[in-house]
């Protein structure tokens, strides 16, 4: 498939108003199509000309003014001004504000808790498999395999700290060299960025919100992928990370430090440990080829145990097998020796839901995965709704200005670096880059933070998570101190190198442009977001893993042609946009390729067919839930939970609305799709009573 979803130089039909046609329209929209259908915000809504309701590519008659979809939306304050309120109104408003704040903090708390449970769920579902990935002996010689194992394991356990700690324990016990561990750490860095991408998927309901949220989340992915793309070959060639970190570790005489402060865990643990508790040592034991661990459950049953170290007499084949000559004897027939054994006595069971169910890990994991995703989704929707109702008018202006404004000239360039420090600091406080970037995602979605500002915050988050790892390393026991510290420093310098590559010079901030491009595509073809997630975090790593197992010859045999084709396509794309005259007429656009190779439209038709039926059912159910919610929150009109439901409702209410023919799509060019020339926002009613 060509690098962009739609390629070609055909011009859009000037007489039709398409989603994606943001250029100046030759004619104004037909007023007869417009109705003054209003929602509770009393704002007029432009009537949408609809495709069949199940399609993910809705066509919108846009107003004539050109709107940049990446411009932050103006959050209109529809409420009564403070000065116009009476005393009762002011008191009511104050308590409403307090209530909203409490609700926001509550939902934020459960949001973070659900992320923790999500991680536990992933560990239960794929933890053992993840551990087995590590026991592959080829990691030593194949950095590419190490990289994809790092990605896969971190995706499976939803925690880079878990995969990093496995690597540390393997290095400490000489099962892995630091050199072999570095690509795994790079992979773990990539894998950890899936969490906020999953969180972004929860905002799929609103196109413009989803565009921003998804781009904001994937800027992290692209930064990590691009960093690896450049730095892995550099590391393989020069071993600079290994050398620098080795020098640092050897030049300092570190004393064991204290554990990194668990600031957020202190608040969330009391709740999450009531849901499930895991014995994470099992994954490490599997990684270290412990056969007994393969049959152990990850669900912790006993929380209070008494470990008694005792010496027992055991028989040995000969005196050579004795622990020591002085601890060797015979009973006249067999030789005996004394062996130190640790006897574990279970005292008290853990206090969590699954302690007495004795369900297999997969079952517990699946239950928790579904529940945590539901809670995550619910909390996210509520956070967005509350923030949406709070961040309006003056409040929104102040917040947006504070976050997104640069320092005055000549210190404007410092703003980004301050954002990096803020990101690092915040991540250090919450002890998790996933939590920080996931909390950032809805804020980007609703337009409080720009992607340009979110980018340095995310980079800072990457640094923050490594400083946590360094502190944790300093708290390691003597034997693991050196290896854990060196690996934590490798992680740190990898991220620093990445920042130096993709941040200081604005021209090099490729991750932002790539994320925006993906945001545009995903806003138009929402299924593409899921497709992206599967491809980049599962299929590509699994393919490389499989090919690596088949041997380096197979890997090179398949990899080289693929890489060659990608480079060829990128070069061709560059020439087409920069100097097309150099190319022969046929290669000046992608029209020589069949439609399915240069456009997502045919694929969209296929996906729509599959999801259509499901979407209809889903939306009906969704609408019922929304109406129930609206009755509870006493809304004057019914809330709509997502764009698809809105489309359905409008299709049912306005039967007279003509449906645009699918042919309308045929000539949309890639340039428009990639540049985000899609409507700035979808009409969306808001439940102000919240």
């Amino acid at each position: 498939m060509a690098p962009w979803p739609e390629l070609g130089d055909a011009q859009p039909n000037p007489d039709k108003y398409l989603e994606g046609a943001a250029g100046q329209q030759p004619t104004a929209p037909d007023k007869s199509k417009e109705t003054n259908k209003t929602d509770n915000t009393e704002a007029p809504v432009t009537k949408i000309e609809l495709l069949p309701s199940y399609s993910t590519a809705t066509l919108i008659d846009e107003p004539t003014e050109v709107d940049d979809p990446w411009n932050l939306p103006t959050l209109q304050d529809s409420g009564i001004k403070w000065s116009e309120r009476d005393t009762k109104g002011k008191i009511l408003c104050f308590f409403q504000g307090i209530g909203r704040l409490i609700l926001l903090l509550g939902f934020l708390y459960f949001f973070v808790c659900s992320l923790d449970i999500l991680s536990s769920a992933f560990q239960l579902v794929g933890g053992k498999m993840a551990g087995q990935f590590f026991s592959n002996s080829s990691i030593m010689s194949n950095p590419l395999l190490g990289l994809v194992i790092g990605v896969l394991v971190t995706v499976l356990v939803q925690s880079s700290s878990t995969s990093t700690s496995i690597v540390v324990s393997m290095v400490s016990s000489s099962l892995l060299t630091v050199r072999a561990a570095i690509p795994i750490i790079m992979g773990a860095n990539i894998g950890t960025s899936i969490t906020n991408t999953i969180v972004a998927l929860m905002q799929v309901g609103d196109r413009s919100e989803f565009r921003r949220a998804f781009a904001g989340a994937t800027v992290h992915d692209f930064f990590n992928w691009l960093s690896v793309l450049v730095l892995l070959p550099v590391e393989v060639a020069t071993h600079y990370l290994e050398i620098i970190t080795q020098l640092i570790v050897e030049s300092f005489h570190f004393k064991n430090g204290e554990d990194a402060p668990d600031l957020l865990k202190v608040i969330t643990k009391p709740f999450t440990k009531l849901i499930v508790q895991l014995d994470k040592k099992v994954i490490s034991q599997i990684a270290m080829n412990d056969e007994k661990a393969k049959n152990k459950s990850l669900v912790k049953i006993w929380c209070k145990t008494f470990t008694n170290k005792t010496q027992i007499n055991v028989t040995v084949p000969s005196t050579a097998n004795c622990t020591s000559p002085s601890l060797c004897w015979t009973d006249g027939i067999q030789n005996w020796t004394m062996k130190n054994v640790t006897y574990k006595e279970n005292i008290a069971k853990c206090q969590h839901i699954f302690v007495n169910f004795h369900l297999p890990d997969l079952a517990v994991g699946t239950i928790l995965l579904i529940l945590s995703l539901l809670v995550l989704c619910g909390c996210l929707i509520m956070i967005v709704k509350i923030l949406g109702s709070v961040l309006k008018g003056q409040v929104a202006t102040v917040i947006k200005k504070t976050i997104n404004t640069d320092f005055p000239f000549p210190f404007a360039w410092l703003t980004g670096y301050l954002a990096i420090l803020v990101g690092a600091g915040m991540t250090f406080i919450v002890q998790s880059s996933s939590v920080f970037t996931s909390a950032l995602t809805p804020l980007i979605g609703i337009g409080v933070i720009t992607i340009e500002r979110a980018y340095p915050l995310t980079l800072g988050s990457n640094i923050g998570t490594t400083t946590t790892a360094i502190l944790a390393a300093l708290a390691s026991p003597g034997n693991a101190l050196r290896s854990s510290l060196q690996i934590a420093l490798c992680h740190f310098f990898f991220n620093i190198s990445g920042i130096l590559l993709w941040y200081p010079i604005p021209f090099t901030r490729l991750p932002i442009r790539m994320a925006k491009g993906l945001g545009n595509i995903s806003a138009k073809y929402r299924w593409f977001a899921v497709f992206y997630l599967i491809i980049f975090f599962f299929l590509i790593p699994l393919t490389v893993f499989g090919l690596s197992l088949a041997g380096w010859r197979v890997l090179v045999g398949v990899g080289v042609p693929v890489v060659f084709i990608i480079i060829l396509v990128l070069c061709l794309r560059l020439l087409q946009s920069r100097c097309p005259r150099v190319l022969p007429k046929k290669l000046q656009n992608w029209n020589f390729l069949p439609l399915w190779m240069r456009s997502l439209k045919p694929w969209d038709a296929v996906v729509s067919k599959f999801t259509g039926c499901f979407q209809m059912r889903c939306c009906c159910c969704c609408r019922v839930c929304c109406r129930a919610c609206c009755l509870l929150c006493d809304c004057p009109k019914c809330c709509r939970c997502s764009k698809c439901c809105e489309d359905l409702e409008e299709a049912q209410e306005g039967q007279d609305v003509p449906v645009k023919a699918p042919e309308t799509f045929d000539n949309i060019t890639i340039s428009r799709e990639a540049q985000g020339e899609v409507p700035a926002s979808d009409s969306k009613t808001e439940c102000t009573a919240l």
Epitope: T319, P325, S326, C328, W329, T330, D331, I333, Q334, W336
Partner: antibody, heavy 119, light 107 residues
Framework: QVQLVQSGAEVVKPGASVKMSCKTS????????MHWVKQAPGQGLEWIGA????????AYNQKFKGRATLTADKSTSTAYMELSSLRSEATAVYYC????????????WGQGTSVTVSS | DIQMTQSPSFLSASVGDRVTITCKAS??????VAWYQQKPGKSPKLLIY???TRHSGVPDRFSGSGSGTEFIFTISSVQPEDFATYFC?????????FGAGTKLEIK
């Protein structure tokens, strides 16, 4: 209580064989080793060998290998020792002793069987 | 084979005396040493095992010490019934071997 009762005294001619028994009671016969010890008149103690009745596994002192055979009958909880090609030096008291589980100390001893080799 | 050298061969003592018997192993036997008491015409009786552990029913005037190659057996206060022959035994490796014995006589 644990008891080890040995067969009576034997007088045999040189070159002949003798088989003595050690009947046990008061414990599970198959869990402990049974040792055999020789004590020549006015001499010290000399270990002949041991048998583990549970499996029939045996171990011998090289000095006695080939001339002493240890067996055990689980059904009667009795251990046996057969001494063959007897010479005058074989004149001694032979004790059976129960080995303590897991090591070579002998906690209970039989009363001994006196064997006299004389022409 | 491991040789156990017991000394003295004969020992005279009076009732109430403290007596010690030494046993030396030709190589390290750890603590795999037992001590036995044998009265004339009787079978041996286990007193001490693992060099220091008293067997059940053995009076606490009997004690053992040592490890490696040198072991000491002590009767803190000799009683009339204690006059007998005492043997040490190693069970560090096969064949099990005994000391020549120490005869404790009334002075």
């Amino acid at each position: 209580q644990v008891q080890l009762v040995q067969s009576g005294a034997e007088v045999v001619k040189p070159g002949a064989s003798v088989k003595m028994s050690c009947k046990t009671s008061g414990y599970t016969f198959t869990t402990n080793n049974m040792h055999w010890v020789k004590q020549a008149p006015g001499q010290g103690l000399e270990w002949i060998g041991a048998i583990y009745p549970g499996s029939g596994a045996t171990a011998y002192n090289q000095k006695f290998k080939g001339r002493a055979t240890l067996t055990a009958d689980k059904s009667t909880s009795t251990a046996y020792m057969e001494l063959s090609s007897l010479r005058s030096e074989a004149t001694a008291v032979y004790y059976c002793a129960r080995g303590m589980y897991g090591h070579g100390a002998m906690d209970y001893w039989g009363q001994g069987t006196s064997v006299t080799v004389s022409s | 084979d491991i040789q156990m050298t017991q000394s003295p061969s004969f020992l005279s003592a009076s009732v109430g005396d403290r007596v010690t018997i030494t046993c030396k192993a030709s190589q390290d036997v750890g603590t795999a040493v037992a001590w036995y008491q044998q009265k004339p015409g009787k079978s041996p009786k286990l007193l001490i095992y693992w060099a220091t552990t008293r067997h059940s029913g053995v009076p606490d005037r009997f004690s053992g010490s040592g490890s490696g190659t040198e072991f000491i057996f002590t009767i803190s206060s000799v009683q009339p019934e204690d006059f007998a022959t005492y043997f040490c035994q190693q069970y560090s490796s096969n064949p099990l071997t005994f000391g020549a014995g120490t005869k404790l006589e009334i002075k």
